[in-house]
């Protein structure tokens, strides 16, 4: 269940979608990418407060218990829902393939 | 790609599969379900540094982009990887059922 | 000897299916990336797609929903599956090695000599 | 989708003379270009790859530059052998992939 989409802390500051601008000498792949030079890194940050975009019943379980033990059980976390893929040119033992990674780009965010 | 089991913070520290007790009235279910009256909820808590547990190629971003950019991009998260179901005898508007949740209880943890 | 050849051309009517082969040999398939080129007579050349080493497929955008293209490792073979054809689809079709914009090791000009397709009532 | 564009489509050029090819992108392809060269009844070949890099086996006549959206091709000195069809291809990789040839420059004796 995607419970409410309301940000109770003020726009922007709850678990959403952010670009970040990033090389391959950021990203360390330097080495072994040829392609993109640079990467528009879409990834999950903000936060987590009670019910916002809980993405199963255990996002609401940690919601209840950390609000109880908030030093024991810390508040849901900002991560991706779903993927984009990406393509990247890479070197290979041969030379150069095309490999596509399912799992790099975040598409959208939930709380858990 | 499930990387580093070894944690460099010590033993217990780092992303692994925790148990809290908690009663009806700490998950706020009290009013609509009868059994169990307490849960061991299994929950995933802990540090994820660098490459320890990296769910995906996004996780070893974030690790990456978190060592660049610590105030912009965070640290990777502990979260389920996979979920053991969970039986409740709830109350219904004809009485009682029972029903299965499969998103109730971690089953093991990854760092994402 | 590192070789390419493309067979399966002729002539087809307009709305049939064709499948090109292109059978290669001096390397595996499960290491090197497989691009087809198409070129009309007496016009230019045209991307059509690439099947990587992992088989992961990638096309232009003209060519997606038409044409599929495959591989049989085993056989040493890529194949390029042509539906609901067009007179427009009238070419010769080369299988070449690679992903063309960046060189592998080894041979850096690996092309087939082509197969004519011709589309026509 | 990728367009890449060439100019001029028709150079006229003496032997021994310079020729500059230019290839522009659509989208930023950084240096994923190469450069062909074709001739009557034959595949293309190879002269430059990775936007600059001499393919093995050609003359050191043939130099490439460029990279994102702008491309060039030289032929320092032109041989007879050089007056050709030439083509760039371009690949842009992000959520997918997909190339695209330039329309050609034919080089043809002045």
């Known amino acids: 269940a995607r419970n409410g989409d309301h940000c109770p802390l003020g726009p922007g500051r709850c678990c959403r979608l952010h670009t970040v601008r990033a090389s391959l000498e950021d990203l360390g792949w330097a080495d072994w990418v040829l392609s993109p030079r640079e990467v528009q890194v879409t990834m999950c940050i903000g936060a987590c407060p009670s019910q916002f975009r809980a993405a199963n019943m255990h996002a609401q379980i940690k919601t209840s218990l950390h609000r109880l033990k908030p030093d024991t059980v810390p508040a849901p976390c900002c991560v991706p829902a779903s993927y984009n893929p990406m393509v990247l040119i890479q070197k290979t033992d041969t030379g150069v393939s095309l490999q596509t990674y399912d799992d790099l780009l975040a598409k959208d965010c939930h709380c858990i | 790609a499930r990387n580093g089991d070894h944690c460099p913070l010590g033993p217990g520290r780092c992303c692994r599969l925790h148990t809290v007790r908690a009663s009806l009235e700490d998950l706020g279910w009290a009013d609509w379900v009868l059994s169990p009256r307490e849960v061991q909820v299994t929950m995933c808590i802990g540090a994820c540094p660098s490459q320890f547990r990296a769910a995906n190629m996004h996780a070893q971003i974030k690790t990456s982009l978190h060592r660049l950019k610590p105030d912009t991009v965070p640290a990777p998260c502990c979260v389920p990887a996979s979920y053991n179901p969970m039986v409740l005898i709830q109350k219904t508007d004809t009485g009682v059922s029972l029903q299965t949740y499969d998103d109730l209880l971690a089953k093991d943890c990854h760092c994402i | 000897e590192v070789q390419l050849l493309e067979s399966g051309g002729g002539l087809v009517q307009p709305g049939g299916s064709l499948r090109l082969s292109c059978a290669v040999s001096?390397?595996?398939?499960?290491?090197?990336?497989m691009t087809w080129v198409r070129q009309a007579p007496g016009k230019g050349l045209e991307w059509i797609g690439i099947i990587s080493n992992s088989g992961s497929t990638y096309y232009a955008s003209w060519a997606k929903g038409r044409f599929t293209i495959s591989k049989d490792s085993s056989k040493n073979t890529v194949y390029l599956q042509m539906n609901s054809l067009r007179a427009e689809d009238t070419a010769v079709y080369f299988c070449?090695?690679?992903?063309?914009?960046?060189?592998?090791?080894?041979?850096?000009?690996?092309w087939g000599q082509g197969t004519l397709v011709t589309v026509s009532s | 989708d990728i367009v890449m564009t060439q100019s001029p489509a028709t150079l006229s050029v003496s032997p021994g003379e310079r020729a500059t090819l230019s290839c522009q992108a659509s989208e930023d392809i950084y240096t994923n270009l190469a450069w062909f060269q074709q001739k009557p009844g034959q595949p293309p070949r190879l002269l430059i790859y990775?936007?600059?890099t001499l393919a093995s086996g050609i003359p050191a006549r043939f130099s490439g530059s460029g990279s994102g959206t702008e491309f060039t091709l030289t032929i320092s000195s032109l041989q007879s052998e050089d007056f050709a069809v030439y083509y760039c291809l371009g690949v842009y990789t992000y959520i997918s992939a997909e190339g695209a040839f330039g329309q050609g420059t034919k080089v043809e004796i002045k």
């Open positions: 001096g390397f595996s398939l499960s290491s090197y990336d």
């Open positions: 990775a936007a600059s």
């Open positions: 070449a090695r690679g992903i063309l914009v960046y060189a592998d090791y080894g041979d850096h000009n690996l």
